[in-house]
Interface confidence: low
């Protein structure tokens, strides 16, 4: 379900009625941040609020996937008057607050990026003292993780009538193009299924019928690089098995 809240122009509730934009809740996040897998990325988030000199307890939260309802990946809390936001949650220890919430900055650093981190992230701040107020970015920042191709699986499988087929699955962003090469094949894109449902960065290519013994090579390529892996097919003639 979707947790949703309202105020004005993406705000949550104010405890006072304000019309000056500088006094209203607002949150500034870029639409997108790009970084390569393995590297770190910074998700910027700054905010304004209507409580002129708030120094009470506060909590900074980042969540992934969707606003209000998505799982939290980071949370920290600062005591009254403190500029130290004590981390209470950092998923897999890879999330770290760069900004100072007391200075209206919730910017977050994400370490050791993986393709699975490619999602939308939403920052949120909660005031919990005399003022009870909070605000969350509804549109969030998209973290776009790029990655050179990596072949995650290559295999030969039996198919009907003593035939064999080959499967190659690779991941990467942009999703890589796959090509097979092998005996009597030249270069073939084969039957490419891309991307797999629920696995946005995975691409699979199938060779439906292997007609010759020998080495079959799958090559995955995108703008960041290429990767290849091979599988060998040796049929025992007169038998129904194969060695791969």
């Amino acid at each position: 379900f979707v947790r949703t809240k309202i105020d004005t122009t993406e705000n949550l509730l104010n405890t006072e009625v304000h019309s000056s934009p500088a006094q209203r809740w607002s949150m500034q996040v870029p639409p997108e941040v790009s970084a390569e897998a393995g590297d770190a990325a910074v998700l910027p988030c700054t905010f304004t609020h209507p409580h002129r000199h708030y120094d009470g307890p506060l909590t900074a939260i980042w969540r992934a996937g969707e606003p209000y309802a998505g799982p939290q990946v980071f949370r920290c809390a600062a005591a009254r008057g403190s500029e130290l936001c004590q981390t209470a949650l950092s998923l897999h220890g890879r999330f770290r607050l760069l900004g100072n919430p007391r200075r209206n900055d919730l910017s977050l650093r994400v370490e050791r990026l993986a393709l699975a981190d490619d999602r939308r992230y939403f920052c949120r701040v909660e005031f919990a003292g005399d003022v009870h107020d909070r605000y969350e970015s509804r549109h969030g920042v998209r973290l776009h993780v790029t990655a050179a191709p990596r072949i995650v699986n290559i295999s030969v499988l039996p198919s009907p009538a003593h035939a064999f087929r080959a499967l190659c699955t690779a991941e990467g962003e942009p999703p890589p193009a796959l090509a097979w090469s092998g005996p009597a094949l030249g270069n073939s894109l084969a039957a490419v299924r891309s991307p797999r449902e629920g696995h946005g960065h995975l691409v699979t290519a199938e060779l439906p019928a292997l007609t010759h013994d020998g080495r079959y090579t799958c090559t995955a390529a995108n703008s960041l690089g290429r990767s290849e892996a091979s599988v060998y097919l040796f049929r025992f003639h007169g038998a129904s098995g194969a060695s791969t």
Epitope: F1, V2, T4, K5, I6, T8, T9, N14, E66
Partner: antibody
Framework: EIQLQQSGAEVKKPGSSVKVSCKAS????????MHWVKQAPGHGLEWIGT????????AYNQKFKGKATLTADRSTSTAYMELSSLTSEDTAVYYC????????????????WGQGTLVTVSS | DIVMTQSPLSLPVTPGEPASISCRST???????????LYWYLQKPGQSPQLLIY???NLASGVPDRFSGSGSGTDFTLKISRVEAEDVGVYYC?????????FGGGTKVEIK
């Protein structure tokens, strides 16, 4: 099905108070802020204020500050509006309405309304 | 406060004919995020208001596509391409750019 069921009509004496209720069903009560709107006889719509049922945080139209008090009871999924120091000017139909959002269509508007509660102030 | 002004006050219509209602705000309702925070509601006789259009031009769920909303930052129009008998009632515009939310005075649509 989302429904907002308001309490029945009230006749009150000048100077007294009235508390109108709005019971929400068909959705998670704390998901959407509850707003209150006034419609005096033969008149248009006037926004009174709003409450976040999750925290009790409120925002009011300055005109209704001190007149209306908004509260919410999460255990019964019910929002309340209390009007104090009633005068004939407070005679009106009062509506509760939830401001609805979806993830794909962020702000959809006052999509769900109660049936209205007529408050008559008369000596 | 943002003042919303509607015209006309009353609109006699013929079924099957088009109709148009105007709404003007004293401040631009176009936010820097690209959204225009103008909403249209219809209150049929004896009923609660119902949402027709959200964010200036988006048709609310279940609303017939003969209704459409358009406009700029301060001038808005609700159009009914072919009025039907069931469309009678009072139409209100509302701004949700900033507190307090404010409604227009309403336009009463009635069959000639």
């Amino acid at each position: 099905e989302i429904q907002l069921q308001q309490s029945g009509a009230e006749v009150k004496k000048p100077g007294s108070s009235v508390k109108v209720s709005c019971k929400a069903s068909g959705y998670t009560f704390t998901d959407y802020d509850m707003h209150w709107v006034k419609q005096a006889p033969g008149h248009g719509l006037e926004w009174i204020g709003t409450i976040d049922p999750e925290t009790g945080g409120t925002a009011y139209n300055q005109k209704f500050k001190g007149k209306a008090t908004l509260t919410a009871d999460r255990s019964t999924s019910t929002a309340y509006m209390e009007l104090s120091s009633l005068t004939s000017e407070d005679t009106a139909v009062y509506y509760c309405t939830s401001f609805y959002y979806t993830y794909s269509n962020y702000d959809v508007g006052f999509a769900y309304w109660g049936q209205g509660t007529l408050v008559t102030v008369s000596s | 406060d943002i003042v919303m002004t509607q015209s006309p006050l009353s609109l006699p219509v013929t079924p099957g004919e088009p109709a148009s209602i105007s709404c003007r705000s004293t401040k631009s309702l176009l936010h820097s995020n690209g959204n225009t925070y103008l909403y249209w509601y219809l209150q049929k006789p004896g009923q609660s208001p119902q949402l027709l259009i959200y964010r200036m031009s988006n048709l609310a769920s279940g609303v017939p596509d003969r209704f459409s909303g358009s406009g700029s930052g301060t001038d808005f129009t609700l159009k009914i391409s072919r009025v039907e008998a069931e469309d009678v009632g009072v139409y209100y515009c509302m701004q949700h750019l900033e507190y307090p939310f404010t409604f227009g005075g309403g336009t009463k649509v009635e069959i000639k």
